[in-house]
């Protein structure tokens, strides 16, 4: 089926949200964000095989397209879907602020 | 310089608008589709080193644990950013009907 | 249920000081960031302050910045809202709120109402 | 600071109308617009958040849209008890700041 959640190469191997443990050091942050001192960052990792969780017409294609021209076609991609936003508390010329931001974590993953 | 169009490992080798000649056969339309028989299929291909078209915060975090952990985290990827419609003549139960498809082609590409 | 109760009303001289109280229940009081939020009579929202839920980072409004200062005790689970050399356009109605990381108000309390007035 | 306007200031409205009020916020706000309704002698109590998203046990008559500086709160068809005050306010940045209110009034 089109859009499919059951992963052919096995659990949990195929396109999904994953959490990683991050400190404001390792996302490059130390230098403008007081808090939170950690993230935990939520991305889209994994395969995406024909058919799973594929984001549109475009998706399609571009699996098809793959499958003949694998040297020329890379296969889709997962990237978020949509994303969670995030307050941080960050440094500014004046001070300190809060300050909202959308695309930071990843809600919910497909194919393109 | 963040969100650079400048790519760092040559020209034509970072995230791009490419162009990829197709038949109807090729895109796995035959069946449904009457046309056109042969489609210029843009798609966004190539590499996302650091800071090039980065799309939003995700994918800066994405590059900087990607740095830090290569193998759990995965390069931002290449996917468009918008799209350009396209008109399909297409079979239906009833005969032939004419259908826009809005995520079909790639219009401009950034990395995610 | 969570529950916010303000406390501390009163009729004030310009120039005076006065210290609200809040009384939260019925959720992990230390988990979250609170903010103050007043109504003028002319009935205009205004924010007045923001504590994180470890209270380690303070916000005010430029107009009470310098005058105001907000705190929190975690283990009465209390807010407090500290207001000295008040002015007449200090007179509101003082709300406590909860904020559940976004910067929106799901919960408000009944609010206490400061006078400011010779 | 964002300066949120909002309009009309008092809305005219008969029980059934399908009535709309806008909030412009003076700069991008992504879609970080929140919608409160205050009934008198009430608390504000939250509608909507991130522009569009409808709070826990709203009626789904109340919507909002809207993205960047331009948002609209719409009441599908008008009850009785919704006459109250509405108010936007922007969670993107502090100073968090809100809009001057919208008076839901009967004709």
């Known amino acids: 089926a089109r859009n499919g959640d059951r992963c052919p190469l096995g659990p949990g191997r195929c396109c999904r949200l994953h959490t990683v443990h991050a400190s404001l050091e390792d996302l490059g942050w130390a230098d403008w964000v007081l808090s939170p001192r950690e993230v935990q960052v939520t991305m889209c990792i994994g395969a995406c095989p024909s058919q799973f969780r594929e984001a549109n017409m475009h998706a399609q294609i571009k699996m098809n397209l793959h499958r003949l021209k694998p040297d020329t076609v890379p296969a889709p991609c997962c990237v978020p879907a949509s994303y969670n936003p995030m307050v941080l508390i960050q440094k500014t010329d004046t001070g300190v602020s809060l300050q909202t931001y959308d695309d930071l974590l990843a809600k919910d993953c497909h194919c393109v | 310089a963040r969100n650079g169009d400048r790519c760092p490992l040559g020209p034509g080798r970072c995230c791009r608008l490419h162009t990829v000649h197709a038949s109807l056969e090729d895109l796995g339309w035959a069946d449904w589709v009457l046309s056109p028989r042969e489609v210029q299929v843009t798609m966004c291909i190539g590499a996302c080193p650091s800071q090039f078209r980065e799309a939003n915060m995700h994918a800066q975090i994405k590059m900087n644990l990607h740095r830090l952990k290569p193998d759990t985290v995965p390069a931002p990827c290449c996917v468009p950013a918008s799209y350009n419609p396209m008109v399909l003549i297409q079979k239906t139960d009833t005969g032939v009907s004419l259908q826009t498809y809005d995520d079909l082609l790639a219009k401009d590409c950034h990395c995610v | 249920d969570v529950k916010l109760v303000e406390s501390g009303e009163g009729l004030v001289k310009p120039g005076g000081s006065l210290k609200l109280s809040c009384a939260a229940s019925g959720f992990t009081f230390s988990s979250f960031a609170m903010s103050w939020v007043r109504q003028t009579p002319e009935k205009r929202l205004e924010w007045v302050a923001y504590i994180t839920s470890g209270g380690d980072y303070i916000f005010y409004a430029d107009t009470v910045k310098g005058r105001f200062t907000i705190s929190r005790d975690n283990a009465r689970n209390t807010l407090y809202l500290q207001m000295s050399s008040l002015k007449s356009e200090d007179t509101a109605m003082y709300y406590c709120t909860r904020d559940d990381g976004y910067l929106w108000f799901a919960y408000w309390g009944q609010g206490t109402l400061v006078t400011v007035s010779a | 600071s964002i300066v949120m306007t909002q309009t009309p200031k008092f809305l005219p409205v008969s029980a059934g109308d399908r009535v709309t009020m806008t909030c412009k916020a003076s700069q991008n706000v992504g879609n970080n617009v929140a919608w409160y309704q205050q009934k008198p002698g009430q608390s504000p109590k939250l509608l909507i958040y991130?522009?569009?998203n409808r709070y826990t046990g709203v009626p789904d008559r109340f919507t909002g849209s809207g993205s960047g500086t331009d948002f609209t709160f719409t009441i599908s068809s008008v009850q009785v008890e919704d006459l109250a005050v509405y108010f936007c306010?922007?969670?993107?940045?502090?100073?968090?700041?809100f809009g001057a209110g919208t008076k839901l009034e009967l004709k």
């Open positions: 991130y522009a569009s």
């Open positions: 306010q922007q969670h993107y940045s502090s100073p968090l700041t």
